[in-house]
């Protein structure tokens, strides 16, 4: 039960994280105009990965896409790439993890296959989360560098009297969304990897041996396990706990409502 819960929770957390990464990538507020210690502007500038926007005091907002590819800073291109890689890996991870979920039955898929798929999706989520965190951090570092550079020469004198105020940009909402989303995806990935360990079938050093006593249908299993009666007993190498309780796989042939989140 704990394994199913861990896997399910990992899936849900990763799903939220990837949705957040997609949202952050699409958002326009990666950097917003710094209004502190600046003449109060009647126009508010903010920029995203794909376009820059201006909001006037009337509420009118005008956005312009970055229609050039070669003219953009290499760092911006790198951030775009990291975010897209994060989304793609996350999406594939989600697809894989859906089939790996214990509560979903696909034909006669072995537990070992589900365990492998869970591990694969977990690793994908971890890499996806790291890509998002890296992308957002690179952009944040770029902002900090530019901020202090523009602060150093904020007022560039032109002919003495005339001044040009350089627009300084600070962290936008998308950065925080990206950091949180990347973290969630990472946590979800770790949870999937932990769940994978619980899903993997445990190999024992002993093979089950059946001794047929006359008149009795009793199968004796060494290794400290309680004997199970009947010839048609499960030959799969599963632990049978004291008190005759069956494994989760035997009890629950169909997914219950509690396994769906």
């Amino acid at each position: 039960m704990a394994v199913t819960a861990c896997q399910g929770l990992g899936f849900v957390v990763s799903l939220i994280g990837i949705a957040g990464i997609i949202a952050a990538t699409c958002m326009d507020q990666w950097s917003t105009q710094d209004l502190y210690n600046n003449p109060v502007t009647a126009v508010f500038n903010y920029q995203g990965l794909w376009r820059s926007c201006v909001r006037e005091s009337s509420g009118f907002t005008e956005c312009r896409g970055y229609f050039t590819l070669l003219g953009l800073p290499a760092m911006l291109q790198a951030v775009r790439a990291l975010m897209i890689v994060g989304i793609v890996l996350g999406a594939i991870g989600l697809l894989v993890s859906i089939f790996a979920l214990k509560c979903i039955r696909i034909g006669s898929m072995e537990d070992s296959a589900k365990a492998n798929m869970t591990l694969t999706s977990g690793i994908m989520f971890i890499v996806s989360g790291l890509c998002a965190i890296a992308g957002v951090s690179v952009f944040a570092n770029m902002l900090v560098t530019n901020f202090w550079m523009s602060t150093a020469n904020m007022y560039t004198g032109m002919g003495g009297m005339v001044q040009t105020v350089q627009t300084r940009y600070t962290f936008g909402a998308a950065l925080f969304v990206g950091w949180v989303a990347g973290g969630l995806t990472l946590i979800g990935g770790v949870m999937m990897c932990i769940a994978c360990r619980g899903l993997a079938p445990e190999e024992t050093n002993y093979k089950a041996v059946s001794y047929h006593a006359s008149g009795h249908s009793v199968a004796y299993k060494p290794g400290g396990f309680k004997a199970s009666t009947g010839f048609g007993s499960n030959t799969k190498n599963k632990k049978i706990y004291d008190g005759g309780a069956r494994t989760e796989d035997e009890v629950q042939s169909y997914p219950s409502k509690h396994d769906y989140v």
Epitope: V40, E56, E62
Partner: antibody, heavy 120, light 113 residues
Framework: EVQLQQSGPELVKPGASVKMSCKAS????????IHWVKQKPGQGLEWIGY????????KYNEKFKGKATLTSDKSSSTAYMELSSLTSEDSAVYYC?????????????WGQGTSVTVSS | DIVMTQSPSSLSVSAGERVTMSCKSS????????????LAWYQQKPGQPPKLLIY???TRESGVPDRFTGSGSGTDFTLIISSVQVEDLAVYYC?????????FGAGTKLELK
């Protein structure tokens, strides 16, 4: 047709207060910001501040903080400006003007003005 | 506050003449975000409220005759009336629309020669 109808002229005593109105018609009142501008006789224009009727958010020229109070009433599509502690320096024509949407913050429609005379 | 300096303060013209008036701002009115200038020109006739002629430094307001042309960028702006008509005699104001407080120039008075 867009119209901003301002209240009539006011003759007030020094130290008193005056509240003038600006009734908007011909457009959705809450969709546009209303600015107020002062013009002394024979002089230039001076921006007082603006009010956004949608959320009652306002911004003032530092010079007029404490002097002017901007409010609005959505139900009657009317913007108001109250001037307090009046002196002869406040004798002027006060205009309300609508900020055009997508017009780079320019004021596209103006009221006819309210003349305020401060005299004892 | 942004200081808007208009020149000349008054102009004496004859009907049909081409008129050029200047407006300089103490700070650039060019917004880096959209590369647009936040400057407007208004016309005010005696006893009337100002009327918007040009916004964004060069965009003519609807209904404004095409003899009015706005140009310039950053800190230097110009309003040109290609052929002055009698009804154009008024005071012309430029306005900073970029920074609060929004500020106006002292005006250029257009008079008949």
């Amino acid at each position: 047709e867009v119209q901003l109808q301002q209240s009539g002229p006011e003759l007030v005593k020094p130290g008193a207060s005056v509240k003038m109105s600006c009734k908007a018609s011909g457009y959705t009142f809450t969709s546009y910001v209303i600015h107020w501008v002062k013009q002394k006789p024979g002089q230039g224009l001076e921006w007082i501040g603006y009010i956004n009727p949608y959320n009652d958010g306002s911004k003032y020229n530092e010079k007029f903080k404490g002097k002017a109070t901007l409010t609005s009433d959505k139900s009657s599509s009317t913007a108001y400006m109250e001037l307090s502690s009046l002196t002869s320096e406040d004798s002027a024509v006060y205009y309300c003007a609508r900020e055009g949407y997508g017009k780079r913050n320019a004021l596209d429609y103006w009221g006819q003005g309210t003349s305020v005379t401060v005299s004892s | 506050d942004i200081v808007m300096t208009q020149s000349p303060s008054s102009l004496s013209v004859s009907a049909g003449e081409r008129v050029t008036m200047s407006c300089k701002s103490s700070q650039s009115l060019l917004n880096s975000g959209n590369q647009k200038n936040y400057l407007a020109w208004y016309q005010q006739k005696p006893g009337q409220p100002p009327k918007l002629l040009i916004y964004g430094a060069s965009t003519r307001e609807s209904g404004v005759p095409d003899r009015f042309t706005g140009s310039g960028s950053g800190t230097d702006f110009t309003l040109i009336i290609s052929s002055v008509q009698v009804e154009d005699l008024a005071v012309y104001y430029c306005q900073n629309d970029h920074f609060y407080p929004l500020t106006f120039g002292a005006g250029t008075k257009l008079e008949l020669k």
